[in-house]
Amino acid sequence: VSITKCNSDMNGYCLHGQCIYLVDMSQNYCRCEVGYTGVRCEHFYL
């Protein structure tokens, strides 16, 4: 899977995680920090 960093405008999109762009799937994706979940890593689940 080809990945790259998200566009600059997505800075801040992922609240507790890193935004990556999945080129083959044409999707931005939030890789959440441990303890966080949700589309934008907005939920703390511990």
């Epitope: 566009n7 405008d9 609240l15 931005n28």
Partner: antibody
């Protein structure tokens, strides 16, 4: 099925304000950014600004700063664009556009006519 | 703000011709460019995103390339149904549309 349904056409007098709504269904606007784009008759596409409904922060194109206000009501899954001090050059079709995890998905557009 | 200079503003070509439209950004946009097709009375239709990724259902005669500040959109063999206005959009840093290219049949 994801949808963005915008409010109906408006006719306004110069100097007045207009507020266009954009109701999302099939997805949560908190997972997205909502952009606003307009197109005057026979003219090109012009980006106006956007809102992050989760953080409630906005970014506007410089030329609209102070005249446009973009808001979102996450309880009704609806975004709004209000443009004040209308002039004839603001006659255009106004589109809301979803961006974020997936690339852009457009509403059907709302025609705003400014005429005395 | 990033500026997008799109050229030409209009062109006339014959059915079967190769058509090329260019967009130049005022700074590096890291391949974050999309191309839209718009027909009169319709909302814009997304053809390509991230420089060269074709949307589902878009014919393979449409393609995109480029990097840095210089980007190209190509119709390899112009068809009558391709008559429309085409716009580039940079979405690296906020958003800016190019001025559009009106494509007509000769």
């Amino acid at each position: 099925q994801d949808q963005l349904v915008q409010s109906g056409a408006e006719v306004k007098k110069p100097g007045a304000s207009v507020k266009v709504s954009c109701k999302a269904s099939g997805f949560n606007i908190k997972d997205t950014y909502i952009q606003w784009v307009r197109q005057a008759p026979g003219q090109g596409l012009e980006w106006m600004g956007r809102i992050d409904p989760l953080r409630r922060n906005t970014k506007y194109r410089e030329k609209f700063e102070g005249r446009v206000t973009i808001t979102a009501d996450t309880s009704t899954n609806t975004a709004y664009m209000e443009l004040s001090s209308l002039r004839s050059e603001d006659t255009a079709v106004y589109y809301c556009v979803r961006s974020g995890r997936l690339f852009d998905f457009w509403g059907q557009g709302t025609l705003v006519t400014v005429s005395s | 703000d990033i500026q997008m200079t799109q050229s030409p503003s209009s062109l006339s070509a014959s059915v079967g011709d190769r058509v090329t439209i260019t967009c130049k950004a005022s700074q590096d946009i890291h391949k974050y460019i999309a191309w839209y097709q718009q027909k009169p009375g319709q909302a814009p239709r997304l053809l390509i995103q991230y420089t060269s990724t074709l949307q589902p259902g878009v014919p393979s005669r449409f393609s995109g390339s480029g990097s840095g500040t210089d980007y190209t959109f190509t119709i390899s063999s112009l068809q009558p149904e391709d008559i429309a206005t085409y716009y580039c959009l940079q979405y690296d840093n906020l958003r800016t549309f190019g001025g559009g290219t009106k494509v007509e049949i000769k």
